[in-house]
């Protein structure tokens, strides 16, 4: 039985040209976390760590994308094109698999303030 | 970049055998190193990998009970050891190394062929 | 365990041909997937990886394609050297698996 939930920083804003930082928190579970993907609207793999072997940063990213902090991505030299949704997976053993979803708008005003969290069940 | 995989080794079911895989040309702590199965005229497997750096394997759980992995820095070596050998285990034995964080098999060694018979 | 199936184990293809290697994820593997090729009596080689980059040194007649469950790995223009099998990978989740090949035979 699936009694975990997924905490993700919801839905953020962040200046072009910036960077932002992508966070998910797995929660109310005793399940080991054996890898996390991260995805990106389109289904592009960011970034995976496993447990194990650390993290892999895919190609397209390697240059904008940072391991951490924790489990979570750092997104640099933030573009237009790089607002939309962002899922993080978290594989687990015993529990299976749970999904987080950030919605990022990278905005061209100087002024860009992350919202509140929300919870994802 | 180079991967030196030990020689051919013929042994008896139910013992042991030990491989080796010594890496030149980077640094080896830096880079996880993993090992891939493929039996006479068959597929890949991969069997597992093990960072240098701290020891840390993960595994195929189908080779859980059967490849230990280790490594010995001083000398740049990884190490599999296989045991309670089986006919099933006779196959060549490959080690490969990743890219930087990239769990591409980027660099293979020569490969050891494990032939197990009574 | 993700299966990636290659549903052909043969293609005869002759010099100069254009040639495509299909290679299907049971479940979804986002862009994680990697191309190998393997000549008689050699190590793999790595080609193609996520899913699309050619790895440093690979001609430019080796590409790569697709998301998700389905993927294909092109040759534009078949040389004899290319005889070989080529393997499709999956490392987006452990443990990472391996497609059963196709051989590549030179008519």
């Known amino acids: 039985m699936m009694t975990g939930t997924i905490e993700t920083t919801g839905n953020i804003s962040a200046k072009k040209g910036g960077s932002v930082i992508l966070q998910c928190h797995l929660s109310s579970t005793m399940a080991q976390v054996t890898q996390v993907n991260w995805e990106q609207h389109d289904h592009s793999l960011l970034a995976i760590r496993n447990a194990e072997l650390g993290w892999h940063i895919y190609p397209a990213f390697k240059d904008r994308v940072a391991p951490g902090p924790g489990l979570g991505l750092t997104l640099q030299s933030l573009t237009m094109n790089d607002t939309g949704e962002y899922f993080c997976t978290y594989h687990t053993y015993p529990d299976g698999t749970y999904r987080g979803r950030i919605f990022l708008e990278v905005l061209e005003s100087s002024v860009a303030e992350h919202s509140a969290r929300f919870q994802i069940p | 970049v180079q991967l030196q995989e030990s020689g051919a080794e013929l042994v008896k079911p139910g013992a042991s055998v030990k491989l080796s895989c010594r890496a030149s040309?980077?640094?080896?702590?830096?880079?996880?190193v993993y090992w891939v199965k493929q039996r006479p005229g068959q597929g890949l497997e991969w069997i597992g990998g093990?960072?240098?750096?701290?020891?840390?394997?993960t595994f195929n759980e189908k080779f859980k009970n059967k490849a230990t992995l280790t490594v010995d820095t001083s000398s740049s070596t990884a190490y599999m050891q296989l045991s309670s050998l089986t006919s099933e285990d006779s196959a060549i034995y490959y080690c490969?190394?990743?890219?930087?964080?990239?769990?591409?098999?980027?660099?293979w060694g020569q490969g050891t062929l494990v032939t197990v018979s009574a | 365990d993700i299966v990636m199936t290659q549903s052909h184990k043969f293609i005869s293809t002759s010099v100069g041909d254009r040639v495509s290697i299909t290679c299907k994820a049971s479940?979804?593997?986002?862009?994680?997937v990697v191309w190998y090729q393997q000549k008689p009596g050699q190590s793999p080689k790595l080609l193609i990886y996520?899913?699309?980059y050619r790895y440093t040194g690979v001609p430019d007649r080796f590409t790569g394609s697709g998301s998700g469950t389905d993927f294909t790995f092109t040759i534009s223009s078949v040389q004899a050297e290319d005889l070989a099998v080529y393997y499709c990978?999956?490392?987006?989740?452990?443990?990472?698996?391996f497609g059963g090949g196709t051989k590549l035979e030179i008519k």
């Open positions: 490969t190394r990743g890219n930087f964080y990239g769990y591409e098999f980027a660099y």
């Open positions: 040309g980077y640094t080896f702590t830096d880079y996880f």
């Open positions: 093990i960072n240098p750096s701290n020891g840390g394997a």
């Open positions: 479940q979804h593997v986002s862009t994680a």
């Open positions: 996520s899913p699309s």
């Open positions: 990978q999956q490392h987006y989740i452990t443990p990472w698996t």
